[in-house]
Amino acid sequence: VPRWRQQWSGPGTTKRFPETVLARCVKYTEIHPEMRHVDCQSVWDAFKGAFISKHPCNITEEDYQPLMKLGTQTVPCNKILLWSRIKDLAHQFTQVQRDMFTLEDTLLGYLADDLTWCGEFNTSKINYQSCPDWRKDCSNNPVSVFWKTVSRRFAEAACDVVHVMLNGSRSKIFDKNSTFGSVEVHNLQPEKVQTLEAWVIHGGREDSRDLCQDPTIKELESIISKRNIQFSCKNIYRPDKFLQCVKNPEDSSCTSEI
């Protein structure tokens, strides 16, 4: 008799999830000498322990505490790049500007990037059929709680000047409901963070508007200023040229505005 299984609105666990997490861990620890001490089997056990046999709408930050402890990694606090709705460009940037870090450049972020996972209450099975959707089902699901936990801690670690890349092509350039807007902004520590500098990335080639004047950016400035952190904003009119100039800053065309 087939066992009844909860049907959620979101996609199920990414296929070969355990193998993927373990392989990513091994790869990351091989590439990053400072993380060579990490035992990837223990990391997987801690990851699994956070959600296996638990109701996938009842996950807490505490469930991920053992994983957070095993994944402890000192990130240079003044080299943090946050992003919202423009992940690919942020990652392309840190691949070139190797001394800066997005969350996905850390072990924990790298392990989980683009993956989905959930379990079932009272069984040791991973649910490959469906997982809770944040909107349609519940917010305290394994994936959302993981990203909320690591994002909060990543923001808490930041100091001096923190950069954030924002997507200027979206109707809400700054979205209060994004992870950046709902978690990271509120967990920057004013005792350590002097300035949040937003880089607004333009989409259209002929778009010469000053998107730093956008109402949502003004809203971000207001939130940040109320937290006693300074705010600055730059337009990145040509993201392709921006990346090229990060790669080759001596290029003669890189002195003009990008």
Epitope: T72, Q73, T74, L108, R153, A157, K192
Partner: nanobody, 119 residues
Framework: QVKLEESGGGLVQPGESLRLSCSAS???????????MSWYRQGPGKQRELVAS???????TYADSVKGRFTISRDNAKNTAYLQMDSLKPEDTAVYYC??????????WGQGTQVTVSS
């Protein structure tokens, strides 16, 4: 310079109490409240084991062997964590270590303080 300093250890009789303190100093602890604070212990000839921890959100966890006897707490204004140890037993004899951990800032340890429970 980062420093975690334990104090409050000593020699007591079974059934008595001790209160350990862990004071954090150095620029890394400018925002002490974001660190999870833990107490570990290492008894003679034993592995280091977690005794108690308190998260930045003040959630506490305890080893089964100390539940109901030990209480962990923190004072963020003083950059200090505490371990109140009541009804001490001879098997609580160990060097007690303080640990401060933040996922993206680092994992820091004190030098340890000796607790001996003996009649």
């Amino acid at each position: 310079q980062v420093k975690l300093e334990e104090s409050g250890g000593g020699l007591v009789q079974p059934g008595e109490s001790l209160r350990l303190s862990c004071s954090a100093s150095g620029s890394i602890f400018k925002v002490f409240r974001v660190f999870a604070m833990s107490w570990y212990r290492q008894g003679p000839g034993k592995q280091r084991e977690l005794v108690a921890s308190i998260s930045s959100g003040e959630t506490t966890t305890y080893a089964d062997s100390v539940k109901g006897r030990f209480t962990i707490s923190r004072d963020n204004a003083k950059n200090t964590a505490y371990l109140q140890m009541d009804s001490l037993k001879p098997e609580d004899t160990a060097v007690y270590y303080c640990n401060a951990d933040h996922t993206f800032t680092g994992d820091f340890w004190g030098q340890g303080t000796q607790v001996t429970v003996s009649s």
